[in-house]
Interface confidence: low
């Protein structure tokens, strides 16, 4: 099942994330994602965790998962590249590299996105973009278009009550509020975007979507940007 | 008060293991890393590695991956490190130390245990 | 790795005078950088962080300033209890790492 959904947001302007990615498993949406280089898309470890035998790709410049766009490129996958020390029952270290299979062909509706090298935190209560294509209600419903929401970041403090995440959120982590607007399921591996620089990562671990006592959380990339510098030389 | 209570000083053989306790006090357990430190005259700090004490998500220098495992016990607020295939270089003072946040953002190492020292001779 | 050099592993000083230790980074890690100070047979004490924010109850005597690669720790007037070992780290990306230390002695 896709891994993550916004939640009380709207459908995004077609194609103003030239950045957006979607991991497709089997040629259906499975998890966002984010375009980091020409070559290089960055996402959440667990989403490939079910993928075992499954054809991993990655879809670029669409707005519609099913309409033809022009801009649309289905990419195969060359090399998934998990954080080496994701493991499956933590949300710690939640990150994937996949290199695509060529260079994507960049332009309007595809172009990378700059990330956080400097590792300090995102002052609490600043605005910043989350989208995907995980569903947009309880029921379940999935949208074809890209949807997307603003989020006012959460400070650590609060996100780490024992009424909240429970001192889970460490350092590398972030959360976002959750009252009504949120991501979630399958909106795993997409972009937290503050300031027009990637923030975040939306993790995929489990967690009740839409509560305010249950922030949403996100992997911080500066904290791993050694790492993904690495993969990337 | 926050304290970190280490466990006492290890004389082993080569090739021998070691577990090393830093028992944690005065703050929730759960809510920031432990991170392990090595002090040698020759090779002056290091940063071993951490662990996220709420889920047992570990990060470790690859320098050490291959020699510490580290581990906690969240009913005791304890972390341990395990050293093993110890030789004369990891003879060392090794420090437990908890992250340390200003405006949410981890800046360094705030509380250190004692140290544990570790001397490795046949 | 990002490494943190402190080229002098020694420095004398005397009671009442301006000390200034220097740290250098293999790359720009924007003003991420911490220093300790570590007295014989204890254990490291943090007294700056983000290069220019005193720990609490760190006196205003010790400052931190630079960025870019380069790091200076000054102590404006050197007290006996100063002596001690100084690191600086980098808290900018893992794996964190430290300087070589530099010692401050008295003349």
């Known amino acids: 099942p896709p891994r993550g959904r916004i939640l009380g947001g709207r459908e995004a302007e077609a194609h103003a994330r030239p950045y957006m990615a979607s991991v497709q498993l089997n040629g259906a949406h499975l998890c966002g994602g984010v375009l980091v280089a020409e070559q290089w898309v960055l996402s959440a470890a667990h989403c490939l965790e079910d993928a075992a035998d499954g054809k991993v790709q990655v879809l670029l410049g669409a707005h519609s998962l099913s309409q033809p766009e022009p801009s649309k490129r289905l990419y195969d996958v060359l090399r998934a590249v998990p954080h080496p020390d994701s493991q499956p029952d933590t949300i710690d270290h939640d990150l994937l590299l996949l290199q695509l299979s060529e260079k994507a062909t960049l332009g309007p509706a595809v172009r990378p996105l700059p990330w956080q090298r400097v590792d300090r935190d995102v002052a609490p209560g600043t605005l910043c973009d989350v989208a995907g294509w995980g569903i947009v209600n309880h029921a379940g419903r999935r949208p074809d278009s890209l949807q997307h929401v603003l989020l006012p970041v959460l400070d650590r403090a609060t996100c780490n009550r024992r009424t909240h995440h429970d001192g889970a959120i460490t350092e590398r982590l972030m959360c976002a509020e959750s009252n009504r607007r949120d991501s979630c399921k399958g909106d795993s591996g997409g972009p937290l975007v503050c300031g027009g620089v990637l923030e975040g990562v939306v993790t995929s671990g489990s967690r009740v979507c839409g509560n305010r006592k249950k922030p949403g959380i996100y992997t911080r990339v500066a904290s791993y940007a050694a790492w993904i510098d690495s993969v990337l030389a | 008060e926050v304290q970190l209570q280490q466990s006492g000083p290890e004389l082993v053989k080569p090739g021998a293991s070691v577990k090393i306790s830093c028992k944690a006090s005065g703050y929730s357990f759960t809510a920031y890393y432990m991170n392990w430190v090595k002090q040698s005259p020759e090779k002056s700090l290091e940063w071993i590695g951490d662990?996220?004490?709420?889920?047992?998500?570990?990060t470790y220098n690859q320098n050490f991956k291959a020699k510490a495992t580290l581990t906690v016990d969240k009913s005791s607020s304890t972390a341990y490190m395990h050293l093993k295939s110890l030789t004369s270089e990891d003879s060392a003072v090794y420090y437990c130390?908890?992250?340390?946040?200003?405006?949410?953002?981890?800046?360094?190492?705030?509380?250190w245990g004692q140290g544990t020292l570790v001397t490795v001779s046949a | 790795d990002i490494v943190m050099t402190q080229s002098h592993k020694f420095m004398s000083t005397s009671v009442g005078d301006r000390v200034s230790i220097t740290c250098k980074a293999s790359?720009?890690?924007?003003?991420?950088v911490a220093w300790y100070q570590q007295k014989p047979g204890q254990s490291p004490k943090l007294l700056i962080f983000w290069a220019s924010t005193r720990h609490t109850g760190v006196p205003d005597r010790f400052t931190g300033s630079g960025s870019g690669t380069d790091y200076t720790l000054t102590i404006s007037s050197v007290q006996a209890e100063d002596l001690a070992l100084y690191y600086c780290q980098q808290h900018y990306s893992t794996p964190w790492t430290f300087g070589g230390g530099t010692k401050l002695e008295i003349k």
């Open positions: 662990i996220n004490p709420s889920t047992g998500g570990t």
């Open positions: 790359q720009d890690v924007s003003t991420a």
């Open positions: 130390a908890t992250t340390y946040y200003s405006g949410n953002s981890y800046v360094g190492f705030a509380y």
